[in-house]
Amino acid sequence: MAVTACQGLGFVVSLIGIAGIIAATCMDQWSTQDLYNNPVTAVFNYQGLWRSCVRESSGFTECRGYFTLLGLPAMLQAVRALMIVGIVLGAIGLLVSIFALKCIRIGSMEDSAKANMTLTSGIMFIVSGLCAIAGVSVFANMLVTNFWMSTANMYTGMGGMVQTVQTRYTFGAALFVGWVAGGLTLIGGVMMCIACRGLAPEETNYKAVSYHASGHSVAYKPGGFKASTGFGSNTKNKKIYDGGARTEDEVQSYPSKHDYV
């Protein structure tokens, strides 16, 4: 039960995280104009990974896409790449984790396969979260560097008469969304990896042999009701109809009323 809960929660947390990473990547407010001592501005600038926007106090908003690849800063390209890699890995991870969920039965998929898929999706979520956090952090670092550079050159005098106000940019909402989303995806991934440990079949030191009781087709398995480790066990009660003795390793897993912690 705890395994199912951990796995399910990891999936949901990762799902929210990846949705957040997608939202952050699409958002226009990665950097917003620093208003410093002027909270009311006639022209407000903000920029995303894909376009820059201007909102006038009249309410008119105009956004322009970056219709160039070569002309963009390498750092921006790197951030775009990290976010896209994060989304792709996260999406694949979600797809894999759906099939790995213990509560979902697909044919006769073994728990060991589910465990492997859970681990795979968990690792994908961790990498996805790290990509998002790295991407957002690189952009934030870029902003901080530019902020202090533009503060140093806040007013460039032209003959001592004309002043050119340099627009400074600070952290936009997308950065915080990205950090939180990346963190959630990372946590979800860790939870999936923890759940994987509980899903993996435990190795026993003996081969459990099924014996026939005369006149009954009910198998008796020594250690059939082992004390639970908290992560579930692969030993199940099972009726044997072919009259042959099997080792526990060969016995396929089916749901039973004892399948809980």
């Epitope: 006639a42 106090s57 106000v165």
Partner: antibody
Framework: EVQLQESGAELVKPGASVKLSCKAS????????MHWVKQRPGQGLEWIGM????????NYNEKFKGKATLTLDKSSSTAYMQLSSLPSEDSAVYYC???????????WGQGTTLTVSS | DIVLTQSPSSLTVTAGEKVTMSCKSS????????????LTWYQQKPGQPPKLLIY???TRESGVPDRFTGSGSGTDFTLTISSVQAEDLAIYYC?????????FGSGTKLEIK
């Protein structure tokens, strides 16, 4: 047709207060900032401040803080400007104007002439 | 606050002539975000409120005759009337639409001979 109808001319004594009105029609009142501009006789234009009819938020020219108070009545699509402690220098024509694209004023009221005289 | 200096303060021309008037700003009115200059031109005829002519330094307001042209960038702006008509008798004001408080130039009075 967009119209900004301002109240009639006012004659007040120095030190008194006055409330000017600007009734908007022909557009969605709550969608545009309403600005107020002062023009003294034979002189240029001075921006007083602005109010947003939807949120009620205001922004004033530092020079007019404490002098002008902008309010509105959404139900009647009317913006108001109260001017207090009036000296004779406040004698001027006061305009209300609607802000549009480019942060420009596309529609203006006809102006209210305020005369401060004893 | 941004200071706008208009010149000349007045000019007298004959109908059909080309007229240019200048507006200089103490700060750049060019917004880097959209590469637009936030300068507006108004025409005020005697006894009337100002009328919007040009915004974004060069965009003509609808209904404004095409003889009115705005140009310039950064700190130096010009309003040109290609062929002055008798009805163009007015005072022309430029306005900073970039930062609060909005400020206006002192105006250029256009008179017709």
């Amino acid at each position: 047709e967009v119209q900004l109808q301002e109240s009639g001319a006012e004659l007040v004594k120095p030190g008194a207060s006055v409330k000017l009105s600007c009734k908007a029609s022909g557009y969605i009142f709550t969608s545009y900032w309403m600005h107020w501009v002062k023009q003294r006789p034979g002189q240029g234009l001075e921006w007083i401040g602005m109010i947003h009819p939807n949120s009620g938020s205001t922004n004033y020219n530092e020079k007019f803080k404490g002098k002008a108070t902008l309010t509105l009545d959404k139900s009647s699509s009317t913006a108001y400007m109260q001017l207090s402690s009036l000296p004779s220098e406040d004698s001027a024509v006061y305009y209300c104007a609607r802000l549009k694209t480019g942060n420009s004023f596309d529609y203006w009221g006809q102006g209210t002439t305020l005369t401060v005289s004893s | 606050d941004i200071v706008l200096t208009q010149s000349p303060s007045s000019l007298t021309v004959t109908a059909g002539e080309k007229v240019t008037m200048s507006c200089k700003s103490s700060q750049s009115l060019l917004n880097s975000g959209n590469q637009k200059n936030y300068l507006t031109w108004y025409q005020q005829k005697p006894g009337q409120p100002p009328k919007l002519l040009i915004y974004w330094a060069s965009t003509r307001e609808s209904g404004v005759p095409d003889r009115f042209t705005g140009s310039g960038s950064g700190t130096d702006f010009t309003l040109t009337i290609s062929s002055v008509q008798a009805e163009d008798l007015a005072i022309y004001y430029c306005q900073n639409a970039y930062t609060y408080p909005f400020t206006f130039g002192s105006g250029t009075k256009l008179e017709i001979k």
